[in-house]
Amino acid sequence: MNGRVDYLVTEEEINLTRGPSGLGFNIVGGTDQQYVSNDSGIYVSRIKENGAAALDGRLQEGDKILSVNGQDLKNLLHQDAVDLFRNAGYAVSLRVQHRLQVQNGPIGHRGEGDPSGIPIFMVLVPVFALTMVAAWAFMRYRQQL
């Protein structure tokens, strides 16, 4: 039985101010060293403690960085991507793709290179049902007091 991995893919603009020790994260990827199969994008491999990214809290390990200060990171050599970050200045705007793994199921397998997301109702319906059950249980409990 193959496990199925599904993702919610969201994009976010993150504005960081370079701190005393810099932006505070590491990257992998690039056209010369693909981190994800069939994807030469740039990914966050490490968030450093107490760095600007860690203190901001939005950037996560595993995030894909799409652009830096409006400059696309597609088809860049790894070194060129590093240079771009290091020369980015004091205020740095990152366009980031988050991928939230939301379900493991028994059918098929979706590879890392395929960012297709699970339909949102598949997440919301169980959450709504749980909320209703909790509310009903609370009302019953209050009636017994």
């Epitope: 020790s21 810099g22 990257i27 992998v28 010369d32 490490r46 450093k48 790894h78 590093v82 290091r86």
Partner: nanobody
Framework: HVQLVESGGGSVQAGGSLRLSCAAS????????MAWFRQAPGKEREFVAE???????????WYVDSVKGRFTISRDNAKNTLYLQMNNLKPEDTAVYYC?????????????????????WGQGTQVTVS
């Protein structure tokens, strides 16, 4: 712990060349981010050049603007050695040159090098340009 021993310093005329070496022991060399710093008399220690092995089969390099095009940093993982080839030396390159190392094998840092990033230091080798 990492031990670093520099060699190759000396006196040279302006326009000349020197090659510094830094032999490392005590830890897997390929997992170390390596750099050269220098300290001129009466001045603070400053960054010169950096080399890292990003764990995916490639090296990364970074230089301070004042040495770009003149200095080349490289490493030989098989020999556990870091090098700094210095060409077209100028009197302002006179300083004690230090090798430094930091364990950082999870990709490449997006931040310019900082002294405080480096955990291990050599004793230094004197370079004098007249």
């Amino acid at each position: 712990h990492v031990q670093l021993v520099e060699s190759g310093g000396g006196s040279v005329q302006a326009g000349g060349s020197l090659r510094l070496s830094c032999a490392a022991s005590g830890r897997t060399f390929s997992s170390l981010r390596m750099a050269w710093f220098r300290q001129a008399p009466g001045k603070e220690r400053e960054f010169v050049a950096e080399n890292w092995w990003n764990g995916q089969g490639g090296q990364g390099v970074w230089y301070v603007d004042s040495v770009k095009g003149r200095f080349t940093i490289s490493r030989d993982n098989a020999k556990n050695t870091l090098y700094l080839q210095m060409n077209n030396l100028k009197p302002e390159d006179t300083a004690v040159y230090y090798c430094a190392a930091h364990r950082d094998d999870s990709g490449s840092t997006v931040d310019p090098p900082n002294q405080s990033d480096y955990d291990y230091w050599g004793q230094g080798t004197q370079v004098t340009v007249s």
